[in-house]
């Protein structure tokens, strides 16, 4: 069920996955929608408590029942992820937030004419996730016109505080407005030896890249294929970054692929959802549900229609004749990070991803017919 | 169900996945929508609490039931991800936020004429995710016209604070407005040895690239294929970045592929969703559901229709005759990051991704016909 309504002065009780800071409830829902498990959120609006350090907290929540009890809480804004909603989604947030200081790693500062230019700088910097701009009204004359480029490990501010004379906002990379070079190459037999900021298991390098693209700080990645000699690292997708924003060291190794985040790109292929079917591959993880369906397409649909489903494994029923309508077993699964915990082969399953995030790819994509 | 309404002064209780900071509830929902698991969010608006550090917090939430209990919370704005909504989505956010300082790593500062130019700089910088521009009204005269390019690990500000005289906003890369070079090549037998900011498992290098493209800080990636010698790294998608934004070292290794984020590109193919089916491939992860469907297409649709489903594996039923309607087993699964944790082959599964994010590709893409 798609619930677009937000509930003011209401907090969802329990189900906390994590807490981030966002400048608005709308952005909180955006974060929740893009979060692997977030189905509900509670956003602590400005003045929601006597403790300003709790303002702008965006509490991402999950529930096995996809609902949580609501409790009254002044200043809280609660709602549901848009995962269940049919409309086209966008990670592009052009809003700027006046008199809000979104805290993060201030890795760059420069004097620019206005907040738009500051946002443009952020959009055109690989590391920049959000920015704060000191306007001409900023109390400290010495800091006026200062554009601070920022990032955090999560892509959201560590905290958000009120600060007169500043404007904050997010990078517009997801708006397709970045002028940064779009590097679509995937490098086979390549390991990038930079900082691993995270690692996930992926069926292939393209999914790995989509994950990197969606990751707040991933700039490039290394993916270890099924043939990677170290069994424990097969299908491992290492999300990476570097201070320069580019890989520093490239190591040639068989059965590894590396590539770049597509976050700066104007996308002509999907980066948010992984529509492929992976044959003879099991995605393992938390079992959310097991249903009998006819075919991997129906199974994928079933997953797409399940707000908590991230991936599935379909085990066709054993056939002694070609009864194509016979149901196989469709395993609906989840994990903490939206990726299977392992990828196995040779078990007869057909694996793939929920298509719920496909609507998050841009309008251009959806009208392309398959070849 | 698609719930577009936001709930003011309401917080979703529990289900927290993470908390980020966003300048608006709209952007919070954007983040939630693009988050692999977020179905609901709570955004803490300005003045939502007495602690300004909690303002602009965007709490991403999930729930196995796709709902969470609502509690009253003054200043909170809660709502649902757009994952379940049918409309076209966009990650493009052209909004600028006046008097908001979005905190992050300030890695570049320069003097520009206005906020638009600052945003353009951000859009044309590989690392920049968002920016803050100090306007002519910024209190500190010396910092007026200063454009700060910013990034965070997550792509959202670490915190957001009120700051008079500044304007903040996001990079417009996802709006297709970046002038940065678009590098679409995927390099076989290539490992990029730069900083790993994250790693995911992907079925192929294209999914890996899409993930990198969607990742807030991924600029390039390395994907290790199924043939990668180190088994534990097979299908590993390493999301990478570097200070320069480009790979510093390229290592020739068989069975690895590398490439670049497409975030800067004007896309003619989808980058957000992964529509392919992966034969003889199992995606492993937390099991979300198992359903019997007819064919991988139905399975993928099932996944797509499941707001929480990210990818799937379809196991066709064993056939000895041509009964085409026979159902196979569709395992709907999810993980914390939307990618499989490992990918295995040889088990007869057909794997793929939910197509829910396909609608998130940009307007340009949908009007391009395939060759």
């Amino acid at each position: 069920e798609c619930v677009t309504k937000v509930f003011k002065d209401i907090s969802f009780q329990g189900g906390d996955l994590s807490t981030v800071f966002t400048p608005s409830a709308t952005y909180c829902r955006l974060v929740c929608t893009h979060h692997p498990r977030c189905l509900l959120f509670t956003f602590m609006a400005e003045s929601s408590s006597d403790d300003p350090t709790k303002w702008f907290a965006c509490i991402l929540k999950d529930s096995v029942t996809e609902i949580l009890p609501m409790v009254n809480m002044t200043g809280a804004i609660s709602g549901y992820s848009f995962k269940q909603c049919p409309q086209q989604l966008s990670t592009c947030s052009k809003d700027v937030y006046v008199n809000l200081d979104m805290k993060g790693m201030n890795y760059n500062s420069s004097v620019v004419k206005n907040a738009r230019e500051c946002q443009e700088r952020c959009t055109d910097d690989a590391h920049c996730q959000f920015f704060t701009y000191a306007t001409g009204y900023f109390p400290s004359v010495d800091h006026r016109k200062m554009c601070l480029l920022k990032y955090t490990r999560t892509g959201t501010p560590t905290t958000i505080t009120k600060l007169n004379g500043v404007v904050s906002g997010f990078s517009l990379k997801s708006c397709g407005l970045s002028n940064l070079a779009c590097i679509r190459d995937i490098f086979p037999n390549t390991v990038l030896a930079d900082l691993n900021i995270d690692s996930v298991v992926a069926p292939d390098a393209f999914v790995c890249r989509r994950i990197c693209t969606h990751h707040p700080t991933c700039l490039f990645f290394t993916f270890f294929s099924q043939a990677w000699p170290k069994e424990s690292q097969r299908h491992l997708c290492l999300l990476k970054t570097s201070e320069s924003g580019l890989p520093s060291t490239r190591i040639t190794k068989s059965h590894a692929l590396s590539g770049f985040s597509l976050q700066h790109c104007r996308h002509s292929v999907p980066v948010f959802c992984h529509p492929s079917f992976y044959n003879d591959t099991d995605f393992l993880g938390e079992e959310l549900d097991i249903v009998d369906v006819k075919g991997q397409e129906t199974c994928q649909k079933t997953c797409t229609n399940n707000a908590r489903c991230q991936f599935f494994t379909y085990y066709p029923s054993h056939r002694l004749c070609n009864e194509r309508n016979r149901r196989g077993r469709c395993y609906l699964k989840l994990s903490s990070n939206g990726s299977p915990t392992r990828i196995l082969h040779g078990r007869g399953g057909i694996s793939g991803y929920s298509l719920r995030l496909c609507k998050m790819d841009n309008v251009c994509t959806t009208k392309i017919n398959p070849r | 169900e698609c719930v577009t309404k936001v709930f003011k002064d309401i917080s979703f209780q529990g289900g927290d996945l993470s908390t980020v900071f966003t300048p608006s509830a709209t952007y919070c929902r954007l983040v939630c929508t693009h988050h692999p698991r977020c179905l609901l969010f709570t955004f803490m608006a300005e003045s939502s609490s007495d602690d300004p550090t909690k303002w602009f917090a965007c709490i991403l939430k999930d729930s196995v039931t796709e709902i969470l209990p609502m509690v009253n919370m003054t200043g909170a704005i809660s709502g649902y991800s757009f994952k379940q909504c049918p409309q076209q989505l966009s990650t493009c956010s052209k909004d600028v936020y006046v008097n908001l300082d979005m905190k992050g790593m300030n890695y570049n500062s320069s003097v520009v004429k206005n906020a638009r130019e600052c945003q353009e700089r951000c859009t044309d910088d590989a690392h920049c995710q968002f920016f803050t521009y100090a306007t002519g009204y910024f209190p500190s005269v010396d910092h007026r016209k200063m454009c700060l390019l910013k990034y965070t690990r997550t792509g959202t500000p670490t915190t957001i604070t009120k700051l008079n005289g500044v304007v903040s906003g996001f990079s417009l890369k996802s709006c297709g407005l970046s002038n940065l070079a678009c590098i679409r090549d995927i390099f076989p037998n290539t490992v990029l040895a730069d900083l790993n900011i994250d790693s995911v498992v992907a079925p192929d290098a294209f999914v890996c690239r899409r993930i990198c493209t969607h990742h807030p800080t991924c600029l390039f990636f390395t994907f290790f294929s199924q043939a990668w010698p180190k088994e534990s790294q097979r299908h590993l998608c390493l999301l990478k970045t570097s200070e320069s934004g480009l790979p510093s070292t390229r290592i020739t290794k068989s069975h690895a592929l590398s490439g670049f984020s497409l975030q800067h590109c004007r896309h003619s193919v989808p980058v957000f969703c992964h529509p392919s089916f992966y034969n003889d491939t199992d995606f492993l992860g937390e099991e979300l559901d198992i359903v019997d469907v007819k064919g991988q297409e139905t399975c993928q649709k099932t996944c797509t229709n499941n707001a929480r489903c990210q990818f799937f594996t379809y196991y066709p039923s064993h056939r000895l005759c041509n009964e085409r309607n026979r159902r196979g087993r569709c395992y709907l699964k999810l993980s914390s990051n939307g990618s499989p944790t490992r990918i295995l082959h040889g088990r007869g599964g057909i794997s793929g991704y939910s197509l829910r994010l396909c609608k998130m590709d940009n307007v340009c893409t949908t009007k391009i016909n395939p060759r």
Epitope: A181, I183, D185 | N179, T249
Partner: nanobody, 124 residues
Amino acid sequence: QVQLQESGGGSVQAGGSLRLSCVASGYTFNNNFVGWFRQAPGKEREGVAAIYSLGGSTYYADSVKGRFTISQDNAKNTVYLQMDSLKPEDTATYYCAGAITWVPPLSHRRYTYWGQGTQVTVSS
């Protein structure tokens, strides 16, 4: 010390061809963006073509697409600009430039290292 040296300029009739070369010392084209830019008297410097050496991705200004070709020889640390079907409006000083970051490929403001330029004159 980084040095970029252009060569291959000269005078040619409209419709003719020239091949410009740019060799670098103290700077490697590998894994970096290299661009050709030009500036006519009284006009702003404009991007002509660029290449990213890692994969050979190329970028061209609309005015030269189909006529100019940029290429590289990593072993010689040299980048070339093959200019065919030259027009009088192609007359300018041509500069080779190297970047050290991911850049808008045809934006001269983002390139760090520059050569001295080589003159190209196309007469009608």
